[in-house]
């Protein structure tokens, strides 16, 4: 079953290569288990950036080597992606799945365009 997912259109990463955005979903039921996946679309190719499964009221469970962190509050997920460089600029899509209890719902956002600008190296000082 389909579900609406909303996310911002554009986000600019900070000078340390960190970008944050909110992924909000319209839950049609009372889910206890939610899975959030961040996908990156660039040059018509889609790759998985990170994924987390969490319980309502609990923290997001990203694997230890993930570049993503996040928190949840109600039907909102606050996602942070770290370690970004200019080459990582692209469309980052939030996918939300209500895993339990049935029925299963899935929704995909329109994507957040994340712009990453590599910082200029500091000039040598004499």
């Amino acid at each position: 079953k389909a579900m609406h997912v909303a996310q911002p259109a554009v986000v600019l990463a900070n000078s340390r290569g960190t970008a944050s955005f909110v992924c909000e979903y319209a839950s049609p039921g009372k889910a206890t288990e939610v899975r959030v996946t961040v996908l990156r679309q660039a040059d018509s190719q889609v790759t998985e950036v990170c994924a987390a499964t969490y319980m309502m009221g609990n923290e997001l469970t990203f694997l230890d080597d993930s570049i993503c962190t996040g928190t949840s509050s109600g039907n909102q997920v606050n996602l942070t992606i770290q370690g970004l460089r200019a080459m990582d600029t692209g469309l980052y899509i939030c996918k939300v799945e209500l895993m339990y209890p049935p029925p299963y719902y899935m929704g995909i956002g329109n994507g957040t365009q994340i712009y990453v600008i590599d910082p200029e190296p500091c000039p040598d000082s004499d």
Epitope: E33, N58, D64
Partner: nanobody, 113 residues
Framework: QVQLVESGGGLVQPGGSLTLSCAAS????????MAWYRQAPGKEREVVAG????????NYGDSVKGRFTISRDNAKNTVYLQMNSLKPEDTAVYYC??????WGQGTQVTVSS
């Protein structure tokens, strides 16, 4: 293969206590949020408690808050549910859950005088 084996269930009087254990094997236990669910006869399965991978975050169903405590030992691949001040309405089959992939077979808890 993946196994979640619950133990510790049984018959207890109202006001009594029980501790359920769930021993996990066949998957990377520390990578999973763990939970306890329960299902009473004729009712839907409901969440009792959940605990994050590190054990740093827990959450509870409204009906058990202040009475039940979930904990985990990642070194032993085990999650626990300490149940105090048990009530007849806590009678159910209690299931261990590796969110959102695996279920245990369940252990029966009966609260009756």
């Amino acid at each position: 293969q993946v196994q979640l084996v619950e133990s510790g269930g049984g018959l207890v009087q109202p006001g009594g206590s029980l501790t359920l254990s769930c021993a996990a094997s066949g998957f990377t236990f520390s990578s999973y949020t763990m939970a306890w669910y329960r299902q009473a006869p004729g009712k839907e399965r409901e969440v009792v408690a959940g605990i994050s991978r590190s054990g740093g975050t827990t959450n509870y169903g409204d009906s058990v808050k202040g009475r039940f405590t979930i904990s985990r030992d990642n070194a032993k691949n085990t999650v626990y549910l300490q149940m105090n001040s048990l009530k007849p309405e806590d009678t159910a089959v209690y299931y261990c859950r590796a969110v959102s992939d695996y279920w245990g077979q369940g252990t029966q808890v009966t609260v009756s005088s």
